[in-house]
């Protein structure tokens, strides 16, 4: 029996819903009874959803996975999961069995947007060409982990004397504190950009330095 | 910053239930996470021997599993292990560790606790 | 389950100079549909629990020195310290995070030269 679900993973924002795709050829005469349908997490064999006899057997996951009743005697077997969670995150194997038997895997991505980053000057007054200064830029609840870039106003890389720190917080969402030591020059713009490498989002922060004294745009 | 803290007594005898809790401090037990128990032989590697979800859900090791218990309490934000029968091949050091949603690597761990198994 | 096999057991060393450490999965780690290897790396010194060091074959840990890197795909992993330092002296553990139950390699022993 050929199980058919998408090559490409779902990705899915936090806290919205996505829908697993999964689905089977049903032969002439087909009826539910003959089906048993099993969700289950391909990493640890979790049950999630089950269908058989002829009766949804229900979420076995936190409660808010549903099939598509209507749609299963067509061989659609789809998974509707409900609130993505960072925690579901992974792969899902569907099983289905008429008289064949056969599975297939379909992988959740979830995601989240970072928040456009905060820029932070320490020290933050007095300054002045040949000083050292530390610039922090902040950015928060974000998933998967960030990529961060720093650079100057005229768009060169700054790459040395950056620490890029990221930390899960109780969601599993992560906050990105990114820290660039720089010399000061005459004056001088400090970008970051922080980008979510699933979303494909940028969120940018930069700091000017003119003597005095500074803008945060 | 989350930490992780094993407690339990050090000496059981064989036969009897090893019963070990691990105390979680500033990070709920309910958020998207998995809490482990892993064990270290004397002189050895490591083994994994099960998790409890966020949601509450188990799984354990397959080599141990009929002997394994892991439960929590969510008021005290605390999740314990029960490991019955026990041997002198269970004599280890006990860790509790945190993993991060479904990726199964461990960020954060107790300092571990040492467990003898002896008459 | 799957098996992990790490080598060599120890590995003498001079200060600044490379070590490399070797580990072999019994089946593959790499999931397709992501292109992830899933493989993660471990220090641990005496007394202490081990330290999550490199996850994803590659992707180094919050905080990790960059002396620390990750490698390999499939089911061949290497992790290198670039230069060594006093305080790299350590055991070392790869461990599959792909399927249950998670297993670890028997260990690599780091000293120095």
């Known amino acids: 029996l050929e199980v058919q679900v998408p090559e490409d993973p779902v990705v899915a924002l936090v806290g919205t819903d996505a829908t697993l795709c999964c689905s089977f050829s049903p032969e002439p005469g087909f009826s539910l009874a003959q089906l048993n349908l099993i969700w289950q997490l391909t990493d640890t064999k979790q049950l999630v959803h089950s269908f058989a006899e002829g009766q949804d057997q229900g979420s076995a996951y936190a409660n808010r996975t549903a099939l598509f009743p209507d749609l299963l005697a067509q061989g659609n077997a789809s998974l509707r999961l409900q609130r993505v969670r960072v925690a579901d995150e992974g792969s899902f194997t569907c099983f289905v069995s008429i008289r064949d038997f056969g599975s297939a895997a379909v992988s959740l991505q979830v995601a989240a947007p970072y928040s456009k980053p905060s820029m932070t000057l320490e020290p933050n007054k007095d300054l002045r060409p040949g000083d050292t200064v530390t610039i922090t830029c902040s950015s928060y609840r974000g998933y998967p982990e960030a990529e961060v870039f720093w650079q100057d106003g005229q768009g060169v890389p700054l790459t040395g004397n950056v620490t890029t720190s990221q930390m899960a917080n109780e969601q599993g969402l992560f906050d990105v504190h990114s820290v660039l030591r720089v010399v000061l020059g005459a004056n001088g713009t400090y970008s970051c950009l922080v980008r979510n490498p699933v979303l494909q989002q940028d969120a940018h922060g930069s700091v000017t330095i003119t003597g005095q004294p500074m803008t945060f745009p | 910053q989350v930490q992780l803290q094993e407690s339990g007594p050090g000496l059981v005898k064989p036969s009897q239930t090893l019963s070990l809790t691990c105390t979680v401090t500033d990070y709920s037990i309910t958020g998207d996470y998995a809490w482990n128990w892993i064990r270290q032989h004397p002189g050895k590697g490591l083994e994994w021997i099960g998790y409890i979800s966020y949601s509450g859900s188990t799984s354990y090791n397959p080599s141990l599993q009929s002997r394994v218990t892991i439960s929590r309490d969510t008021s005290k934000n605390q999740f314990s292990l029960k490991l019955s029968s026990v041997t002198a091949a269970d004599t280890a050091v006990y860790f509790c560790?945190?993993?991060?949603?479904?990726?199964?690597?461990?960020?954060?761990w107790g300092q571990g606790t040492t467990v003898t198994v002896s008459s | 389950d799957i098996v992990m096999t790490q080598s060599p057991d120890s590995l003498a060393v001079s200060l600044g100079e490379r070590a490399t450490i070797n580990c072999k999965s019994s089946q593959s780690l790499l999931q397709s549909s992501n292109q992830k290897n899933y493989l993660a790396w471990y220090q641990q010194k005496p007394g202490q629990p081990p330290k999550l060091l490199i996850y994803?074959?590659?992707t180094r840990e919050s905080g990790v020195p960059d002396r620390f890197s990750g490698s390999g795909s499939g089911t061949d992993f290497t992790l290198t310290i670039s230069s060594l330092q006093a305080e790299d002296v350590a055991v070392y553990y790869c461990?599959?995070?792909?399927?249950?139950?998670?297993?670890f390699g028997g260990g690599t022993k780091v000293e120095i030269k």
């Open positions: 461990q599959q995070h792909y399927s249950a139950p998670w297993t």
């Open positions: 994803f074959a590659s």
């Open positions: 560790a945190r993993s991060l949603g479904r990726r199964w690597y461990f960020v954060v």
